[in-house]
Interface confidence: medium
């Protein structure tokens, strides 16, 4: 067992070295380790094959370090890995698209608060078992086409607290099992009418605190399972162009937040849902 760590076997073979001031991944981690806790240290780099010997590893926590670089082959050989937590590493900024390849059993991936500015093509390729993907509180500006295409089992996608300005047509392709999509506290001004086409199982959608003045009801039409929708804190324009959204909200059987109008001035602060159809005039 490495010097700064504690190793124990029950209930799982564990190497635990949190908050020890470590500046590098320690050498001598027992190969039988099923869980490795390295959070809260000062590790800045995860070299290639850092954990290659740990074939039984299911949980790896590297959160709250000072990671600036993760070699593309850092997690090579971890075919049984189920939880990988890299969050709270604000200097990371980018992740090589090959980093997570081969992690076919991964079901939870934490990349929140990593200063990420973009999601490289193929970053999540092959992560067929992934259920939870935490990408909140980064600096993401765009959602490239087909980024999540292979994530057919993903149920929770957290993208809040970024700088995303639009939701393009193919941003969420392939997310057939998605239950919860959090997009609040971004800069979303435009949602493509077909952006949510694959989200037939979505139950919760947060779009509050964005820059939406309108939302095409065509985008909401595929959301057959939707139960909870938050649209507050957007600059909604409640003129004739809001009529389709107003009509959709009247028919919506689930729960929704208020949808306060910003314009026209005479309706400022009023809830779109509570307006009458003939209030929505002038274009």
């Amino acid at each position: 067992c490495p010097g700064a760590c504690v190793c124990y076997n029950e209930p799982k073979v564990t190497t635990s070295c949190p908050q020890q001031g470590l500046q590098a991944v320690p050498v001598g981690i027992p190969a039988a380790s099923q869980r490795i806790f390295l959070h809260g240290n000062r590790i800045s780099h995860v070299p290639a094959a850092s954990f290659r010997a740990c074939r039984n590893l299911t949980i790896l926590w590297l959160h709250s370090n000072v990671l600036a670089r993760i070699d593309a082959a850092a997690f090579t050989g971890l075919a049984l890995l189920e939880q990988l937590d890299l969050s709270d590493n604000a200097q990371l900024r980018s992740v090589d698209p090959a980093t997570f390849h081969g992690l076919g059993r991964l079901h939870t991936l934490h990349l929140d608060r990593c200063g990420l500015q973009e999601l490289g093509p193929g970053l999540f390729r092959g992560l067929a078992a992934l259920q939870y993907l935490y990408l909140q509180d980064n600096a993401l500006q765009a959602l490239p086409d087909d980024t999540f295409r292979d994530l057919g089992n993903l149920t929770h996608l957290f993208l809040h607290g970024n700088r995303i300005s639009s939701v393009p047509e193919r941003a969420f392709r392939g997310l057939h099992s998605l239950d919860r999509l959090l997009l609040h506290q971004n800069r979303v001004a435009h949602v493509h009418p077909h952006a949510f086409r694959d989200l037939g199982r979505l139950m919760t959608l947060y779009l509050f605190a964005n820059n939406l003045s309108a939302l095409p009801t065509e985008a909401l039409a595929p959301l057959r399972a939707l139960q909870y929708l938050r649209l507050n804190d957007n600059p909604w324009v409640c003129d004739c162009r809001a009529r389709p959204l107003w009509a959709w909200l009247q028919k919506f059987r689930g729960s929704s937040s208020e949808v306060p109008c910003s314009l026209p001035q005479r309706l400022a602060g009023r809830d779109l849902k509570r307006l009458a159809a003939n209030d929505l005039q002038g274009c």
Epitope: V6, Y8, S16, P18, Q19, H110, F158, L182
Partner: antibody, heavy 122, light 110 residues
Framework: EVQLVQSGAEVKKPGSSVKVSCKAS????????FSWVRQAPGQGLEWMGG????????KYAQKFQDRVTITADESMSTVYMELNSLRSDDTAVYYC???????????????WGRGTMVTVSS | QSVLTQPPSASGTPGQRVTISCSGS????????VNWYQRLPGAAPQLLIY???QRPSGIPDRFSGSRSGTSGSLVISGLQSEDEADYYC???????????FGGGTKLTVL
């Protein structure tokens, strides 16, 4: 001031189920973690599990994993704890408690409900 | 049997300084922060200390906390009669993947 208002006392038969509710005042419901903690007569505090409404995920103490279900209704700002297959030693005061959302585990609890007394007796 | 170990009782006279200990292991206090709760008779628990040594607003500075290795301590300096209560330590346990409490310490002000 944030308050947690719990449902009233319950008397249940062994083998039955109980569902306790906890309504949070204020509009920041989703941004917190909610735990359920119980205290049996003459015993200490015991964490049963919790839920983070925004993430929609519940986590349970190993002891209760098979018997407890914790859910949240965001539209009602309410969390629920359902305990099945009740036994006499489940007689306790059940507290709902709120804590800040720090990572994905349940951190300290800074606001507590007043508790719901559940008595299991034949 | 509680995961965290506290003395079942402690006592002191008004004005005295009392320390309550909380012993854990590497998977809980050794890896995670300690919190302390006060439970007055007939009342719900109240947070006294979080993050090992931080006091929420409204908690008097007579209460202080610390953590060293796998143990935590709560110190009450200048004991007052209204401090008579049960005190519980708590932490997260990585091994059990859950929150754990101590068995509680009943503080009597003599």
């Amino acid at each position: 001031e944030v308050q947690l208002v719990q449902s009233g006392a319950e008397v249940k038969k062994p083998g039955s189920s109980v569902k306790v509710s906890c309504k949070a005042s204020g509009d920041t419901f989703s941004s917190f973690g909610f735990s359920w903690v119980r205290q049996a007569p003459g015993q200490g505090l015991e964490w049963m599990g919790g839920i983070i409404p925004m993430y929609g995920t519940a986590k349970y103490a190993q002891k209760f994993q098979d018997r407890v279900t914790i859910t949240a209704d965001e539209s009602m700002s309410t969390v629920y704890m359902e305990l099945n297959s009740l036994r006499s030693d489940d007689t306790a005061v059940y507290y709902c408690a709120r804590g800040p959302l720090v990572r994905y585990y349940f951190y300290y609890m800074d606001v507590w409900g007043r508790g719901t007394m559940v008595t299991v007796s034949s | 049997q509680s995961v965290l170990t506290q003395p079942p009782s402690a006592s002191g006279t008004p004005g005295q300084r009392v320390t309550i200990s909380c012993s854990g292991s590497s998977s809980n206090i050794g890896s995670n922060t300690v919190n302390w709760y006060q439970r007055l008779p007939g009342a719900a628990p109240q947070l006294l200390i979080y993050n090992n040594d931080q006091r929420p607003s409204g908690i008097p500075d007579r209460f202080s906390g610390s953590r060293s290795g796998t143990s935590g301590s709560l110190v009450i300096s200048g004991l007052q009669s209204e401090d008579e209560a049960d005190y519980y330590c708590a932490s997260w346990d990585d091994s059990l993947n859950g929150r754990v409490f101590g068995g509680g310490t009943k503080l009597t002000v003599l």
